[in-house]
């Protein structure tokens, strides 16, 4: 398993919530992305391809998420100080092979200014 700090802006704040950006290489066709808070799985999203190149998106731990061709964004709302923690994007690449797991992350700091406009 490869571990490292995200070398991009992982946290994007808006309206009392945060978008956590988990990037993956654009060559990746099938994968599972998990968002970890400390060691706890908060969210996951799995993209697989079936016969005829039909794309299937599944989520065992559902969060509001957004998929693009090189990233998964997970959205957390109603931020408070308890959200401050290390967050990790745990990427398991199934296709193309070989199977590979990468873990990248960063610390989410919560400041008063980010709590002002709560999204209800």
């Amino acid at each position: 398993e490869i571990n490292g700090s995200a070398n991009y802006e992982m946290f994007i704040f808006h309206n009392g919530g945060v978008q956590i950006l988990c990037k993956y290489p654009d060559i990746v066709q099938q994968f599972k992305m998990q968002l970890l808070k400390g060691g706890q799985i908060l969210c996951d999203l799995t993209k697989t391809k079936g016969s005829g190149n039909t794309v299937s998106i599944k989520s065992l731990k559902f969060c509001h998420s957004q998929l693009s061709n090189n990233s998964v964004s997970f959205f957390l709302y109603n931020l408070d100080h308890s959200h401050a923690n290390y967050y990790f994007c745990n990427l398991s690449i199934f296709d193309p092979p070989p199977f590979k797991v990468t873990l990248t992350g960063g610390y989410l700091h919560i400041y008063e200014s980010q709590l002002c406009c709560q999204l209800k």
């Epitope: 060559i27 092979p97 070989p98 199977f99």
Partner: antibody
């Protein structure tokens, strides 16, 4: 045209560290999906995979040799370097580097000609 | 680690024979298997990737089949230049692993 060429010492002494360089052309290790791997073959024996480095600098090693191996890349020079510590006569082998291009599923599609390393005092 | 077991370890055959080499993985590897040919004092050459796809420039007498754990390399009509050692290799997961090789000798 894709080519790879291995270079390094022909003879090393036991306990020394071996440094091998793979110089390649025809592709770039900064291209998404590209990887370079090292493989060795002792005289009269089977191929043994050693290590691989990929485009985003992730590194993978043989389970039995990982404590002795380090792989690195210099993208600007089109080179991959493998170091192997604490060499022993059983490490006498021909060492190959090979390209693997993951998004095309080709396996180790192009190999260097190999460099022979003898470990002896 | 995934173990790759090849059989037989050697075989004798004549020009024109149909030759079959098998490779078994210790766990499922989908179709992520490659076959290589190696002649004495030469580097291996890639023959087949993704279990059944022929590398560019490889003669059509070579074919591969299988998925999961059991795979086969077939040479439909053995030619003099085909006498060599053949290796399978999985690239489903790290560490990558090779089979022990099959030496095809002249009968």
């Amino acid at each position: 045209q894709v080519t790879l060429r291995e270079s390094g010492p022909a003879l090393v002494k036991p306990t020394q560290t071996l440094t091998l360089t793979c110089t390649f052309s025809g592709f770039s290790l900064s291209t998404s999906g590209m990887c370079v791997s090292w493989i060795r073959q002792p005289p009269g024996k089977a191929l043994e995979w050693l290590a691989l480095i990929d485009w985003d600098d992730d590194k993978f090693y043989s389970t039995s040799l990982k404590t002795r191996l380090t792989i690195s890349k210099d993208t600007s020079k089109n080179q991959v370097v493998l170091t192997m510590t604490n060499m022993d006569p059983v490490d006498t082998a021909t060492y190959y580097c090979a390209r693997m291009s993951t998004p095309t599923y080709y396996g180790l599609d192009v190999w260097g000609q190999g460099t022979t390393v003898t470990v002896s005092s | 680690d995934i173990q790759m077991t090849q059989s037989p370890s050697s075989l004798s055959a004549s020009v024109g024979d149909r030759v079959t080499i098998t490779c078994r993985a210790s766990q499922g590897i989908s179709s992520w298997l490659a076959w290589y040919q190696q002649k004495p004092e030469k580097a291996p050459k890639s023959l087949i990737y993704a279990a059944s796809s022929l590398q560019s420039g490889v003669p059509s007498r070579f074919s591969g089949s299988g998925s999961g754990t059991d795979f086969t390399l077939t040479i439909s009509s053995l030619q003099p230049e085909d006498f060599a050692t053949y290796y399978c290799q999985q690239y489903n997961s790290y560490p990558l692993t090779f089979g022990g090789g099959t030496k095809v000798e002249i009968k």
